[in-house]
């Protein structure tokens, strides 16, 4: 979506399908103030942008409110009436969805299933992460809904755990974005911890009988 | 492997519309990509149609626009093109094809020439 | 609208040549820019994407470059294959072709 144009870069972000954030870097006009004009439907008349996005003191990108649309956004940023560059991109190509909420664990024994509010729209994939101290990488598992379960834990580690959700590629296409992280929560024997120990507690000596 | 196989009557009259259908195979119709329409007027070059995403968003050819119907039928895994008021200048080979993501129009039929004439 | 001009509208080689073809913008398109081959009854044949992404399967001859509003195809040793009319397509806003360039043999 970036590439120059003209000294031109752009970047779009759809969020959560409600809101559409298009910025530009435009190093040639670094000190103007360009214009932001659009429309959702190519037989409109070109809107201005009304809520522009500022860099020390000079626009540098526009936000839109385009709540669940599957439109094509036709743009065009301007230096005065001249077209500085000129594009129309489908917005779902530029989805992030938004972090997920009301996320939730349920234990049984050596598996957790995590679970968490799924969003309005489909096609999405929803990713846990999880590690404990004596993991050197995040192991992940993601399923279709927020109702994820991961087995063969060990219950007496620590684990930290975080979810987000990203769009199937092969709907949304590649320049998706996935979303923030939900906040990092830990657990150890079924219970939630503040934290789990940087480095991993040694194991307890067996008590001889 | 993606096939496209265009479909409809090689022979329209003046004023009429036309019409022609996409058939996809080896590949689902709902996915991100673009189905699209494309022609080739005799002794000419290439003229992009315009093209449509399996929810039915469209997006066509401004010169053409008032003129032409893009639809798509996802049950039956095909798209359709409708041209309407249609003169000699609109006889041309009709192709589809695939415009997969920002890479350009990567599968495509094997084009069905469309004469327009009494 | 974004019109495509491409030079030369014909060019005569023969096999072995090093080719080279432009394309023009009439306003910016960043690298959203693709290029076919095209031979007579047949479907058009994409080459390159994204001004200088070489296809899958498509032979390391072709090369593409360019960003903005200039373009190159580059065929660095023609093959008999290769005599065919080539189109430069923008599908950064909404679609344009070029008018083409026939290449044909010497």
């Known amino acids: 979506q970036g590439g120059a144009a003209e000294g031109v870069q752009i970047q779009i972000i759809y969020f959560n399908l409600e809101t559409v954030q298009v910025t530009w870097n435009a190093s040639k006009y670094s000190r103007t103030n360009l214009t932001f004009h659009y429309r959702f439907n190519g037989d409109e008349a070109y809107d201005q942008c009304t809520n522009y996005l500022l860099q020390e003191g000079h626009t540098s990108g526009c936000l839109l409110d385009a709540e669940q649309r599957d439109d094509i956004l036709y743009f065009s940023i301007r230096n005065g009436t001249h077209p500085v560059f000129t594009a129309s991109r489908w917005m779902v190509y530029y989805l992030k969805p938004s972090s997920p909420k009301h996320v939730r664990f349920s234990w049984h024994q050596d598996a957790v299933t995590v679970t968490c509010s799924d969003l309005s729209y489909g096609d999405l994939l929803y990713e846990v992460q999880y590690r404990s101290p004596f993991d050197t990488e995040w192991q992940s598992k993601q399923e279709n809904t927020c109702n994820v379960t991961i087995e063969g834990l060990d219950a007496e580690k620590c684990y930290s755990f975080w979810v987000r959700v990203k769009a199937m590629e092969d709907v949304y296409g590649p320049d998706t974005y996935p979303s923030d992280w939900s906040e990092v929560t830990c657990w150890q024997r079924g219970e939630i911890r503040d934290a789990c120990a940087e480095t991993p507690t040694p194991p307890k000596p067996k008590l001889s009988k | 492997q993606v096939q496209l196989q265009e479909s409809g009557p090689g022979l329209v009259k003046p004023s009429g519309t036309l019409s022609l259908t996409c058939a996809v195979s080896g590949g689902s119709i709902r996915s991100s990509n673009w189905w699209s329409w494309v022609r080739q007027p005799p002794g000419k070059g290439l003229e992009w149609i315009g093209e449509i995403y399996h929810g039915g968003t469209t997006n066509n050819n401004p010169s053409l626009k008032s003129r032409v119907t893009i639809s798509v039928d996802q049950s039956k895994s095909q798209f359709s093109l409708k041209l309407s008021s249609v003169t000699a200048a609109d006889t041309a080979v009709y192709y589809c094809?695939?415009?997969?993501?920002?890479?350009?129009?990567?599968?495509w039929g094997q084009g069905t020439l469309v004469t327009v004439s009494s | 609208d974004i019109q495509m001009t491409q030079t030369p509208s014909t060019l005569s080689a023969s096999v072995g040549d090093r080719v080279t073809i432009t394309c023009r913008g009439s306003h910016s398109i960043s690298n959203w820019l693709g290029w076919y081959r095209h031979k007579p009854r047949k479907a058009p044949n994409l080459l390159i994407y994204k001004a200088s992404s070489l296809k899958s399967g498509v032979p390391s001859r072709f090369s593409g470059s360019g960003s903005g509003t200039e373009f190159t195809l580059t065929i660095t040793s023609l093959q008999p294959d290769d005599f065919a009319t080539y189109y430069c397509?923008?599908?950064?806003?909404?679609?344009?072709f070029g008018q083409g360039t026939k290449v044909d043999i010497k």
């Open positions: 094809a695939r415009h997969r993501y920002s890479s350009g129009l990567d599968y």
């Open positions: 397509q923008q599908y950064n806003h909404y679609s344009t």
